[in-house]
């Protein structure tokens, strides 16, 4: 029995619903009474959802899963996962048994966009060219871990003297803090780009230092 799932991971935003696609080819005369379907977590073997003897056996996964009952008879064994959480990320295996059996695994990649970075400067007054300043770029509640890039006003990458830390909160979402230590020129713009590698989403923040006062676009 051939069971088919998408080759590419299913990407789902935190808090939204995701469909893990799984299909099989029913033979002529197939009835749902013959179908045994099991969804489980690939690594831990934890039961997620099942269907047996013509009956949906329900969710064993925090009551957040559902099948598509009207589509099962056509060979659609897809699973709906509601209110996706970071902890849901991973591989799910779809096992289908009629007379023969088959299985295939589909990956769920969870993502959350990062907030627009906030920029802070230390010290933030009485700045002169030649002073060393610390610029902090902070972006919140994203997933997975971000890539952080700094550049100056001419678009030249700034890679030295950068320290980036990422801390997960209780939901598994990351708060990113990136610190750039730089010696001030006569004036200048310093930009921070926080990239979500899964969503290919960039969040920009910048600070422009022009003697007195400074501006934070």
């Amino acid at each position: 029995l051939e069971v088919q799932v998408p080759e590419d991971p299913v990407v789902a935003l935190v808090g939204t619903d995701a469909t893990l696609c799984c299909s099989f080819s029913p033979e002529p005369g197939f009835s749902l009474a013959q179908l045994n379907l099991i969804w489980q977590l690939t690594d831990t073997k934890q039961l997620v959802h099942s269907f047996a003897e013509g009956q949906d056996q329900g969710s064993a996964y925090a009551n957040r899963t559902a099948l598509f009952p009207d589509l099962l008879a056509q060979g659609n064994a897809s699973l709906r996962l509601q209110r996706v959480r970071v902890a849901d990320e991973g591989s799910f295996t779809c096992f289908v048994s009629i007379r023969d059996f088959g299985s295939a695994a589909v990956s769920l990649q969870v993502a959350a966009p990062y907030s627009k970075p906030s920029m802070t400067l230390e010290p933030n007054k009485d700045l002169r060219p030649g002073d060393t300043v610390t610029i902090t770029c902070s972006s919140y509640r994203g997933y997975p871990e971000a890539e952080v890039f700094w550049q100056d006003g001419q678009g030249v990458p700034l890679t030295g003297n950068v320290t980036t830390s990422q801390m997960a909160n209780e939901q598994g979402l990351f708060d990113v803090h990136s610190v750039l230590r730089v010696v001030l020129g006569a004036n200048g713009t310093y930009s921070c780009l926080v990239r979500n590698p899964v969503l290919q989403q960039d969040a920009h923040g910048s600070v422009t230092i022009t003697g007195q006062p400074m501006t934070f676009p």
Epitope: L1, E2, N36, F95, S97, R99, D100, F101, G102
Partner: antibody, heavy 117, light 108 residues
């Protein structure tokens, strides 16, 4: 008439390997899942492993996972069980069985595997 | 895994008597249960599947009943060839198939 004939059993030492075979006839071999079920001397039946009709999916009992490998060859209607790192508790008669909806409608006569030092 | 408990371990009866064998599942398996007969020195033979459907060629003195967690195999009138060991098997959790420990039906 469905026929299942196992071979390859014998006496081995702990840690050694053995490969069992099952020759199937009398049905469309590639359309059915196949399984191995074992029975230790004087004991009950224990499911060991199953393989889908295409050979693309396999299932194993926890007691043999990582040590045993089930496979099949539809060109010669044969089922196999490669058994590595054998232990004394693997001593049993090994039956090849044709699966239908995950129960077993036809069984072979079995082949005896003895693991002893 | 689903544990199947068969009782009694041994049933001693005379030919012509009725035999009632029990199989209890540790959790509901709906009707995903099969029964097998194994005569001494022989291979197992499928008797019942789906808790109550007789396999091809099985005499009608064999019948199965039950659903959920409680199942029964009944042999209405024991024949000499029925003295054997009987096993139940669940396939509700077909990723981890399990058998009961068996009931031996012996001649009184």
């Amino acid at each position: 008439d469905v026929q299942l004939v196992e071979s390859g059993g014998g006496v081995v030492r702990p840690g050694e390997s053995l490969r069992l075979s099952c020759a199937a006839s009398g049905f469309t071999f590639s359309s059915y899942a196949m399984s191995w079920v074992r029975q230790a001397p004087g004991e009950g039946l224990e499911w060991v492993s199953s393989i889908s009709g295409s050979g693309g999916s396999t299932l194993y009992a926890d007691s043999v996972k990582g040590r045993f490998t089930i496979s099949r060859d539809s060109s010669n209607n044969s089922l196999y069980l490669q058994m590595n790192s054998l232990r004394a508790e693997d001593t049993a008669v090994y039956y090849c069985a044709k699966a239908r909806n995950n129960f077993f409608d036809y069984w072979g006569l079995g082949t005896l595997v003895t693991v002893s030092s | 895994e689903i544990v199947l408990t068969q009782s009694p371990g041994t049933l001693t009866l005379s030919p012509g008597e009725r035999a009632t064998l029990s199989c209890r599942a540790s959790r509901s398996i709906l009707t995903s249960l099969a029964w097998y007969q194994q005569r001494p020195g022989q291979t197992p033979r499928l008797l019942i599947y789906g808790a109550n459907s007789r396999a091809t060629g099985i005499p009608d003195r064999f019948s199965g009943s039950g659903s959920g967690t409680e199942f029964t195999l009944t042999i209405s009138s024991l024949q000499s060839e029925d003295f054997a060991v009987y096993y139940c098997q669940q396939y509700y959790d077909w990723l981890t198939i399990t058998f009961g420990g068996g009931t031996k039906v012996e001649i009184k």
